[in-house]
């Protein structure tokens, strides 16, 4: 449905508040270094222009595309060359190349200061003084640090952020009310950002077909009673939504996501019995709720898959007639029967089935050739099952912190060239799989664990892509989206790695460690552990454990000392010497 003015269309559909919020998110995700005030000014200018187009769609420039309007606005920033360097060259290009250029310059790890949370009273005063600016600042700070954050979902986070302050700034104990809510929003926000980053990577690096396959599998697990036609329609619409958001088309994305939620709720009888509560909520909550809804129960009496996909005489005929549709049907039928499998496992099975049909449908006796295809699935299913069983046992034995340390050592030995902060961040997140998934019963462990690991390993892939240092990481990240985790799991110690030179400064600690939160202290110790492995990749678990135990005792001792700084200086030297001796450095 062509509109005379796209900007007027979206303004009317979304309303002024959402329009302004989404434009701010879009601008902050593109120009991540620009000050807040500059972005607010640009957003206000765009909003005023949109209002003139609503009043008269034939007014000057109202017929321009959103990319043209937004790109022109971004290119008016005076300090573009000084702040962003070669990104300024994007402005010499025409649409659609200009937008593609901006997208390529999005930075997953921007050089921005860590967000420090002010005192509760300070935050509440700021909230009461100017609620609108306070909430815009939240959108801005999250969007610029997470340039692929799912924009309509960020509006939902902002709504919860506002609700937390509205409630807690009136409470008797503001901090007790507010801080847990902010912690929860922060943790959920990081998880949401990482999940969306994988969707965008899937679309951008592996194409629409890869994303659609993921969506068929996931939606078939979630809506096993829905017909294939219904799932296909939802997949098409969902792909459009995520393509738009990942492409920076945030107004279209939010608008289409609202339409999709409306459609799902109007057709819930033929989609899922679990949607009733979600569909009674307001728009932002409704969309979020649908995205997180539990799997519906499987239909009764589903027949064996073999009847359609192995025993039928028409397998090759059906495959030849419409390959992707037939493979989509296979994926749909397999996934709706297996909520206990991870999506990536289902995609591996579909790939194996496709490869088998490609080979067998060209053979003299196709049926004889593909008759045992389901037997090939067994090892593919058992591999993640065994891996999860082993790692959950290890997690239960060690607890989260020590489990993270085991993973830190494992991954540093696999890819020691990767930067220490990245190894720490990724290994800590990998380690969280234990508390997140091991508590689940067998039937829920694999989808929880392996699909979560896909999200975390994608963080490694996008961070590594910015500054590639390891051919092994590049290979695992680029060869196959669904085999990333098995690829990393299969990596052994990198024998080609030349150990890092010993630098005493890396292992010098000061009294400031004593005032850090438990989490920050853990990160300091884990950073030291990674550096230790980089210096001595052949160190045994026992050697590393001994050194880390000594280190923990050293920190505890000096933090209790009267003259902390002297203790850290003197005892630190002794610890370094003892560690060098223990590890033969």
């Amino acid at each position: 449905d062509a509109h005379k003015s796209e900007v007027a269309h979206r303004f009317k559909d979304l309303g002024e508040e959402n329009f302004k919020a989404l434009v701010l998110i879009a601008f902050a995700q593109y120009l991540q270094q620009c000050p807040f005030e500059d972005h607010v000014k640009l957003v206000n200018e765009v909003t005023e222009f949109a209002k003139t187009c609503v009043a008269d769609e034939s007014a000057e420039n109202c017929d321009k595309s959103l990319h043209t309007l937004f790109g022109d606005k971004l290119c008016t920033v005076a300090t573009l060359r000084e702040t962003y360097g070669e990104m300024a060259d994007c402005c010499a290009k025409q649409e659609p190349e200009r937008n593609e250029c901006f997208l390529q310059h999005k930075d997953d790890n921007p050089n921005l200061p860590r967000l420090v949370r002010p005192e509760v009273d300070v935050m509440c005063t700021a909230f009461h003084d100017n609620e609108e600016t306070f909430l815009k600042k939240y959108l801005y700070e999250i969007a610029r640090r997470h340039p692929y954050f799912y924009a309509p979902e960020l509006l939902f986070f902002a709504k919860r952020y506002k609700a937390a302050f509205t409630e807690c700034c009136q409470a008797a104990d503001k901090a007790a009310c507010l801080l847990p809510k902010l912690d929860e929003l922060r943790d959920e926000g990081k998880a949401s950002s990482a999940k969306q980053r994988l969707k965008c990577a899937s679309l951008q690096k592996f194409g629409e077909r890869a994303f659609k396959a993921w969506a068929v599998a996931r939606l078939s697990q979630r809506f096993p009673k829905a017909e294939f036609a219904e799932v296909s329609k939802l997949v098409t619409d969902l792909t459009k939504v995520h393509t738009e958001c990942c492409h920076g088309d945030l107004l279209e994305c939010a608008d289409d996501r609202a339409d999709l939620a409306k459609y799902i709720c109007e057709n819930q009888d033929s989609i899922s019995s679990k949607l009733k509560e979600c569909c009674e909520k307001p728009l932002l909550e409704k969309s979020h709720c649908i995205a997180e809804v539990e799997n519906d129960e499987m239909p009764a009496d589903l027949p064996s898959l073999a009847a359609d996909f192995v025993e039928s005489k028409d397998v090759c005929k059906n495959y030849a007639e419409a390959k992707d549709v037939f493979l989509g049907m296979f994926l749909y039928e397999y996934a709706r029967r297996h909520p206990d499998y991870s999506v990536v496992l289902l995609l591996r099975l579909a790939k194996t089935y496709e490869t088998t049909l490609e080979k067998c449908c060209a053979a003299a006796d196709p049926h004889e050739c593909y008759a045992k295809v389901f037997d090939e699935f067994k090892p593919l299913v058992e591999e993640p099952q065994n891996l999860i069983k082993q790692n959950c046992e290890l997690f239960e034995q060690l607890g989260e912190y020590k489990f993270q340390n085991a993973l830190l050592v494992r991954y540093t030995k696999k890819v020691p060239q990767v930067s220490t902060p990245t190894l720490v961040e990724v290994s800590r997140n990998l380690g969280k799989v234990g508390s997140k998934c091991c508590k689940h019963p067998e039937a829920k462990r694999m989808p929880c664990a392996e699909d979560y690991l896909s999200v975390v390993l994608n963080q490694l892939c996008v961070l590594h892509e910015k500054t590639p240092v390891s051919d092994r990481v590049t290979k695992c990240c680029t060869e196959s989206l669904v085999n990333r985790r098995p690829c990393f799991s299969a990596l052994e110690v990198d024998e080609t790695y030349v150990p890092k030179e010993f630098n005493a400064e890396t292992f010098t600690f000061h009294a400031d460690i004593c005032t850090l939160s438990e989490k920050e202290r853990q990160i300091k110790k884990q950073t030291a552990l990674v550096e230790l492995v980089k210096h001595k990749p052949k160190a045994t678990k026992e050697q590393l454990k001994a050194v880390m135990d000594d280190f923990a005792a050293f920190v505890e001792k000096c933090c209790k000392a009267d003259d902390k700084e002297t203790c850290f200086a003197e005892e630190g030297k002794k610890l370094v010497a003892a560690s060098q001796a223990a590890l033969g450095l």
Partner: nanobody, 118 residues
């Protein structure tokens, strides 16, 4: 507009056979599992059988298992139900419907009447 046109019903003696057909239009036939349901005089709707999207997988109500066979021809957008060893209790209006084991009301065609009587 979704349309389902059933045919093939008639009067048959106990132990006899019939073949029902259902021609579908207005939707992508091969993207839907399909079912047959029936309604005996003065009774509610009863599920008879279902077939998967590709057509290899089928499921039958206990009352018709071993006597009825369901199939489909996706190229012709047509659904079939072969009725063998018919009994008087099979007398009903037979409808084809979209979906596997339909447990929610769905739009029905005109139906085709099967009468088993000596």
């Amino acid at each position: 507009e979704v349309q389902l046109q059933e045919s093939g019903g008639g009067l048959v003696e106990p132990g006899g056979s019939l073949r029902l057909s259902c021609v579908a239009s207005g939707f992508t036939f091969q993207h839907y599992a399909m079912s047959w349901v029936r309604q005996a005089p003065g009774k509610g709707l009863e599920w008879v059988s279902s077939i998967s999207i590709v057509g290899g997988g089928t499921s039958y109500a206990d009352s018709v298992k071993g006597r009825f066979t369901m199939s489909r021809d996706n190229a012709k957008n047509t659904l079939y139900l072969q009725l063998n060893s018919l009994k008087s209790e099979d007398t009903a209006m037979y409808y084809c419907v979209r979906g596997w084991h339909p447990d929610v009301p769905r739009p029905l065609g005109q139906g085709t009447l099967v009468t088993v009587s000596s």
